[in-house]
Structures are given as structure tokens and as C-alpha cells.
């Protein structure tokens, strides 16, 4: 697994003219694990990065990802409750210049090297689920979430709101 040392925590203005497109309002480092406490790890294999879901040994260090939070450009009122906040989307970067991407054709989650502005496939709508868990919904494919399948990350279609709490799309964020 590779570390986050190449990623600098830095502060940006909300509308930074030096960056094309929107800029994150908040960024911080966190490790990502499944509902069942398996760790999401990243490894360089054959000149490409692979993503694994695995149990770590007792003292093995967790990989960190840089979580960047972006405000949508319009208020989100799909619930009809008059909430005036703007919907948040996140990008996840485990190492410098690489971001998690949704490959909707292959129903897979991949690490791609890319430059700003990031493509829509790198953005995920953040959901709060039960037990301090979050879920990541594809910006490019509403109703499709990052999930766990066969010890890998995959894209999983969620058909109804009752299935939003299915364990394989629930993740925990930890800063320790």
C-alpha cells in the first residue's frame, strides 16, 4: 500500500480563479473502511493502482485518502423540506494526482490519474447513513453507489430508499 505523503493539506479560497472550475471548501485526510471494519487499501501493481478491501494485521497502518468537499452550485431541495443548504459532493484521492473514478460501463471503481478540472466521474454525492456510516453516490449515475463486491470496490445500483442501508454500500471514515 502507498501512503499519502505526496498529498499536501492545503487551503484554497472558495472560488480560486487559478483553478478551472469549482474548488473544494474543505479538505482533510481520513482512512476508509467498510461497515464490517475491513480497510480500503491501495497498491501499485504492474504500473497501475489497484484497490483492495481487506483485513489489516494488528499494527498495520491504514491508507489515508484526501477527502475534498465541494458544494453543488444550486441548493438541493429534493426532499421538499425547504432545506437551504447546498448538496455536498466529495472526491477521494489516495495519492497525489490520482482520484477514485466511477466507471459506469464496467460497474467498477478505478483509480485514474488526471488534472483539474476533475471529470464528473470523480465526484460522489455524500450520504449520511446509520451508525456513523456514509455512502458515496455517483454524480454521473444517480442511484448507483460505491460498494463492496468480492473484496473489491464496485458500483452497486440501489433500487429503493429501503436499500440505502444495505451493508455493502456503507463506509466509515476515520482520522486516526
Amino acid at each position: 500500500a502507498f501512503g499519502i505523503s505526496g498529498v499536501q493539506k492545503y487551503t484554497r479560497a472558495l472560488h480560486d480563479s487559478s483553478i478551472t472550475g469549482i474548488s473544494p471548501i474543505t479538505e482533510y485526510l481520513a482512512s476508509l473502511s467498510t461497515y464490517n471494519d475491513q480497510s480500503i487499501t491501495f497498491a501499485l501493481e504492474d504500473e497501475s493502482y489497484e484497490i483492495y478491501v481487506e483485513d489489516l494485521k494488528k499494527d498495520e497502518k491504514k491508507d489515508k485518502v484526501l477527502l475534498s468537499y465541494y458544494e453543488s452550485q444550486h441548493p438541493s431541495n429534493e426532499s421538499g423540506d425547504g432545506v437551504d443548504g447546498k448538496m455536498l459532493m466529495v472526491t477521494l484521492s489516495p495519492t497525489k494526482d490520482f482520484w477514485l473514478h466511477a466507471n459506469n460501463k464496467e460497474h467498477s471503481v478505478e483509480l485514474h490519474k488526471c488534472e483539474k478540472p476533475l471529470p464528473d466521474q470523480a465526484f460522489f454525492v455524500l450520504h449520511n447513513m446509520h451508525s456513523n456510516c456514509v455512502s458515496f453516490e455517483c454524480k454521473t449515475d444517480p442511484g448507483v453507489f460505491i460498494g463492496v463486491k468480492d473484496n473489491h470496490l464496485a458500483l452497486i445500483k440501489v433500487d429503493s430508499s429501503e436499500n440505502l442501508c444495505t451493508e455493502n454500500i456503507l463506509f466509515k471514515l476515520s482520522e486516526t
Partner: nanobody, 121 residues
Framework: QVQLVESGGGLVQPGGSLRLSCAAS????????MGWHRQAPGKQLELVAV???????NYADSVKGRFTISRDDTKNTVYLQMNSLRAEDTAVYYC???????????????WGQGTLVTVSS
Amino acid sequence: QVQLVESGGGLVQPGGSLRLSCAASGSIRTVNYMGWHRQAPGKQLELVAVVTSGGGTNYADSVKGRFTISRDDTKNTVYLQMNSLRAEDTAVYYCNAAASTYSSTVVRSFWGQGTLVTVSS
């Protein structure tokens, strides 16, 4: 509806201290992070500090070692202790929170109205 109310701003001399508070209220189900941004006259909005639900923090380089962010989860309140204040810290300080409400799982960004901090002799 989620409301953020800031307090604690004011006039302080260089080298002095202030403590800002921000209380979140409304139909809050889960808070992911709470933080502070600031906007100085003629400047862009910038992140000052953020604290996550797990207790992780991130600071702007310009305030590291001088400002401390903390959070009281039981009150959905975030604090910013500002020490060794400088003239360049003069700005309107805005509270920002990422949270979901009882009516939707989607996480949204909410902002307070801001509180003015003036550092001047």
C-alpha cells in the same frame, strides 16, 4: 432547516485573543464536520480550520500554532480559540457545517451569517 449562529467576534489588539463560537440548530441528524472560513476586505473566502465528527482537524498554514478548533458534539457547537492575533487576521469569520437532516440522507453545506473580528491597536 439548519441554522448556524456565530458569536464572539469583536475588536482586539495585536497579540490578543478571542474565542469564537458557532451553534448549529434545527433538524440535524448527523454532522460530518464543522469549520471556520474567513473573508478579509477585498480578499477571497478561505478555510481557517475544520474539525470532523471523528475529531480530526485541519488548519490553514497561516493560523497553525495560533488557532485551535474544538467541538462539543452534545451541543452541535464548534469553537475557534484565536491567540497571538495579527492585523492580517482581521476578517469576517463564517461558520460552515456539513450535515444531513431527518428528511434526507444527503449531506449539505450550511453557513452562518458571520462575525467580524478586527485586530487593531
